[in-house]
Interface confidence: low
Amino acid sequence: FEIALPRESNITVLIKLGTPTLLAKPCYIVISKRHITMLSIKSGERIVFTFSCQSPENHFVIEIQKNIDCMSGPCPFGEVQLQPSTSLLPTLNRTFIWDVKAHKSIGLELQFSIPRLRQIGPGESCPDGVTHSISGRIDATVVRIGTFCSNGTVSRIKMQEGVKMALHLPWFHPRNVSGFSIANRSSIKRLCIIESVFEGEGSATLMSANYPEGFPEDELMTWQFVVPAHLRASVSFLNFNLSNCERKEERVEYYIPGSTTNPEVFKLEDKQPGNMAGNFNLSLQGCDQDAQSPGILRLQFQVLVQHPQNESNKIYVVDLSNERAMSLTIEPRPVKQSRKFVPGCFVCLESRTCSSNLTLTSGSKHKISFLCDDLTRLWMNVEKTISCTDHRYCQRKSYSLQVPSDILHLPVELHDFSWKLLVPKDRLSLVLVPAQKLQQHTHEKPCNTSFSYLVASAIPSQDLYFGSFCPGGSIKQIQVKQNISVTLRTFAPSFQQEASRQGLTVSFIPYFKEEGVFTVTPDTKSKVYLRTPNWDRGLPSLTSVSWNISVPRDQVACLTFFKERSGVVCQTGRAFMIIQEQRTRAEEIFSLDEDVLPKPSFHHHSFWVNISNCSPTSGKQLDLLFSVTLTPRTVDLT
């Protein structure tokens, strides 16, 4: 190899050992029969050398540094050349370094031709191995602006007082151009300005100078984003730290098109703006730090640019001003496992503060919009508490459990609407009366409606789930002893069309001791399946539930149990079932922990089924499934 550097080129070439490898055989630079491990070539020198091994790239690296002095004479602006040409250099991992020194009053601009640059964080590497490391200067201190790969959005970086640019090329890379030019600009009066250009949808992750170490004290850094007017940009902070400020406050400032309050100032911990149309600037301003305990200011953030969906231009008013004790959360559905880039999906309050989830509370009117490629990625969960503190005031009072129409008109699917119904202990109970009779969801007869009501105890210590109920059955009402939650859960987008079928009224009634009472009025020729609460986990200890089953005058009811034995084993107490004719009061009592369950029985009049549990041994729980079928009395039942 021969390397000749022109006089006054201000170029130095250094060949040195790279990261030591565990290769058994050493390798040397051979020059005039001398074996050396480092070679420095300065301006005006010409050196011929070779290597003592076949694969020098496994041992050596080459650094080519060009010093550009803009202090004492004119600055060589324009496209930067790779000197010496890569074709003249040995095939080693090589780093070209340009060190430009200039006056504080002169701005220097690095312009990157396409492909533009993409900033990477600590520990990351570039897929093709080509990296651009850029640093600036504050007096004598070097400040790292960042490390960049190809194929990004960064088109220009402006600095003042000097810039150091290092381009690292792996030995096998064919690149023979620097890919950037230098221009002079007026003073920028800050550490640097980074321009990021989006030509279509995409995202960029950017970092404060010196990241992950601290941003220089009391400095200012600006990012300029060029975004086509038809697209929308959202900013989210991925990671930040605040230092200990003695004077001034660390903050970010935005210049946003169309804003009447430019600059808009945000704390780093604030939600950052979203749904911005067109170009905007973001600046990071440091503070005077506490000398004893400075801490560090650092910021890593992402800008996401995407098409506004039809929805992003629509404002939805959610009027919760007349509601009490209610919260509405719009949030992402649990994601399936996708690792590819997906555009962001945000919900925006007042069109500006956008985040992936948003909770609205009662007592106010809220204006929201969406910035999302696919609104099916979001869903809504609502919680409302209806509580009675004074039993004298609440008794016989009724409330309609209806999803407010404002919520149904939102373009996001409702997942759960939960009503927490609270009553004074041992004073009042509750009765749920549906607009349409309900069916209990069972394996034998599953619900296939677009929504169900999930009814469960709301007493923290009590694990009691009454079941899942949907319209189109035989359950006329459900009475419960104490606090419960009723959750309307939707299963299909068709809920919007079926919303009229929802409708449940809750009334506060005098207290009763049973955990629950189901009033069942079966329809002719349909089999009603009923099961004990807490199916699969067993009816809780010492719990009693009843079914009040109506039999019309011209019908007969067949009661069938689906097991021979209940399977319960009692640790203490007895588990029993009472079947009682309501007209004659005649009753049959079955010991569930001892007797076999009754064979199918026929009832000509309305009757009760009451099941009371003992304290069962673990694993031997009480779960019963039974059915009721009506047939006309004229049929010969023998």
Epitope: P122, G123, V335, K336, Q337
Partner: antibody, heavy 119, light 107 residues
């Protein structure tokens, strides 16, 4: 409750194939990713790969590309691991595990299936 | 790929003592690290997710800490049933990797 139940132990000859099944119950299979982990006798855990249960697309760790195939039958809520051209060094316990979240942690595991390859 | 190195390979303690298990990553993985316990003949069990988040049903004596490349699993007072092998797992990027394990044995 959530359960992953794997098929029983297998004794195979070198060069043969084996198909290990993992039946999911107590949750919807397509709501969570399914991962496979190998543990050779007396050794540690090795992540083999995962299958996107929604799309059926598998991803393999480098050491498990080629002879290892991950598949699904959502109609029976079951994930499968098939190994072809078995070698003695494939002798191990193979676990399926359910992945939670975007960057998974494995909250439920199958009981493991011992595959022994011996002539 | 991320290489996880656990230390010590074996830790001998008596019941009631404090156990400190270490896991070091070959590069920064933020908090994408989970801990598992495995007893002989059993499947692994998730103990801690995302370096320090507790798991429902896992005793409070198990805690995790760390971020970046250094992580610690602490058992404040070892119980007889805690003697097992403990693995850390990176979920930072494909391929997900496990540490080689730390065996906690009775002294």
């Amino acid at each position: 409750q959530v359960q992953l139940v794997q098929s029983g132990s297998e004794l195979k000859k070198p060069g043969a194939s084996v198909k290990v099944s993992c039946k999911a119950s107590g949750y919807t299979l397509t709501d969570f990713s399914m991962h496979w982990v190998r543990q050779a006798p007396g050794q540690g855990l090795e992540w083999m790969g995962w299958i996107n249960t929604e799309t059926g697309a598998p991803t393999y760790a480098d050491d498990f590309k080629g002879r290892f195939v991950l598949s699904l039958d959502t109609s029976v809520s079951t994930a499968y691991l098939q190994i072809s051209s078995l070698k003695a060094e494939d002798t191990a316990v193979y676990y399926c595990s359910r992945g939670r979240d975007y960057d998974p942690h494995f909250d439920y595991w199958g009981q493991g299936t011992l595959v022994t390859v011996s002539s | 790929e991320i290489v996880l190195t656990q230390s010590p390979a074996t830790l001998s303690l008596s019941p009631g003592e404090r156990a400190t298990l270490s896991c070091r990553a070959s590069q920064s993985i933020s908090d994408f690290l989970h801990w598992y316990q495995q007893k002989p003949g059993q499947s692994p069990r998730l103990l801690i997710k995302y370096a320090s988040q507790s798991i429902s049903g896992i005793p409070a004596r198990f805690s995790g800490s760390g971020s970046g490349s250094d992580f610690t699993l602490t058992i404040s007072s070892v119980e007889p049933e805690d003697f097992a092998v403990y693995y850390c797992q990176s979920a930072h990027s494909f391929p997900y990797t496990f540490g080689q394990g730390t065996k906690l044995e009775i002294k």
